[in-house]
């Protein structure tokens, strides 16, 4: 489970995004493909610094549907 306001790097960052975004998906492409400006951003913000749940959610592919 996600622990707020911590450094997330590598596979832990990928897995946490999968958990947070669920079926929505997120702004990562496949390994070895060209790194996008967006994906560089999340590593900068969550691995090189610490990030919280709200910031992680901004990288989900589409907004969560409101009930």
């Amino acid at each position: 489970a996600y622990r707020p306001s911590e450094t997330l790097c590598g596979g832990e960052l990928v897995d946490t995004l999968q958990f947070v975004c669920g079926d929505r998906g997120f702004y990562f492409s496949r390994p070895a493909s060209r790194v996008s400006r967006r994906s560089r951003g999340i590593v900068e913000e969550c691995c090189f610094r610490s990030c919280d749940l709200a910031l992680l959610e901004t990288y989900c592919a589409t907004p969560a549907k409101s009930e």
Epitope: G10, G11, P31, A32, V35, F48
Partner: antibody, heavy 120, light 107 residues
Framework: QVQLVQSGAEVKKPGASVKVSCKAS????????MHWVRQAPGQGLEWMGI????????SYAQKFQGRVTMTRDTSTSTVYMELSRLRSDDTAVYYC?????????????WGQGTTVTVSS | RIQMTQSPSPLSASVGDRVTITCRAS??????LNWYQQKPGKAPKLLIY???SLQSGVPSRFSGSGSGTDFTLTISSLQPEDFATYYC?????????FGGGTKVEIK
Amino acid sequence: QVQLVQSGAEVKKPGASVKVSCKASGYTFTSYYMHWVRQAPGQGLEWMGIINPSGGSTSYAQKFQGRVTMTRDTSTSTVYMELSRLRSDDTAVYYCARDVQWLAYGMDVWGQGTTVTVSS
Amino acid sequence: RIQMTQSPSPLSASVGDRVTITCRASQSISSYLNWYQQKPGKAPKLLIYAASSLQSGVPSRFSGSGSGTDFTLTISSLQPEDFATYYCQQSYSTPLTFGGGTKVEIK
């Protein structure tokens, strides 16, 4: 072809600093993070940290925090690793290595290594 | 900090042998495990990433498996050029850490 070419061997005295360079070619320099890894004689591999060549941001292993500085020059597609306050146990081969993606899938291209010897 | 432990070391084998090297993580790292080959005086070479994905250009006799804490690198039929030291590396969290290495020697 994709390659990383590092600077030559260095001999330093304890307390001094060393700056190792790593010049990238054959790919878009700013699209891949760069790691630094070292290997003491007859020992295993030790991760030192990583730099984003695009913005220059860095993340260092706690062990080296305060002693290591990683920088880059986008005009020459070169990254640098400077280690200060050298000790005899810093004697090692220092490698730069390209990150595959997001620190999650390994290091796919390595420099040839730079031998740093620290001796009085 | 995640500790990586490799075994056996060293490993004696002959050309044509099936060789298995194991790597254990001190906590679960999902499938974020990479394998490298290093020959004396040379830089490491990435063989396997994400536990089981073969890096481009690496011969198919190399394979990887495992998830969680236990992983294996298998060489199905050892070739003369495969005598080297092999390292596992976790890429689940920083600091990235490597196993101590397994040297594959000629029997």
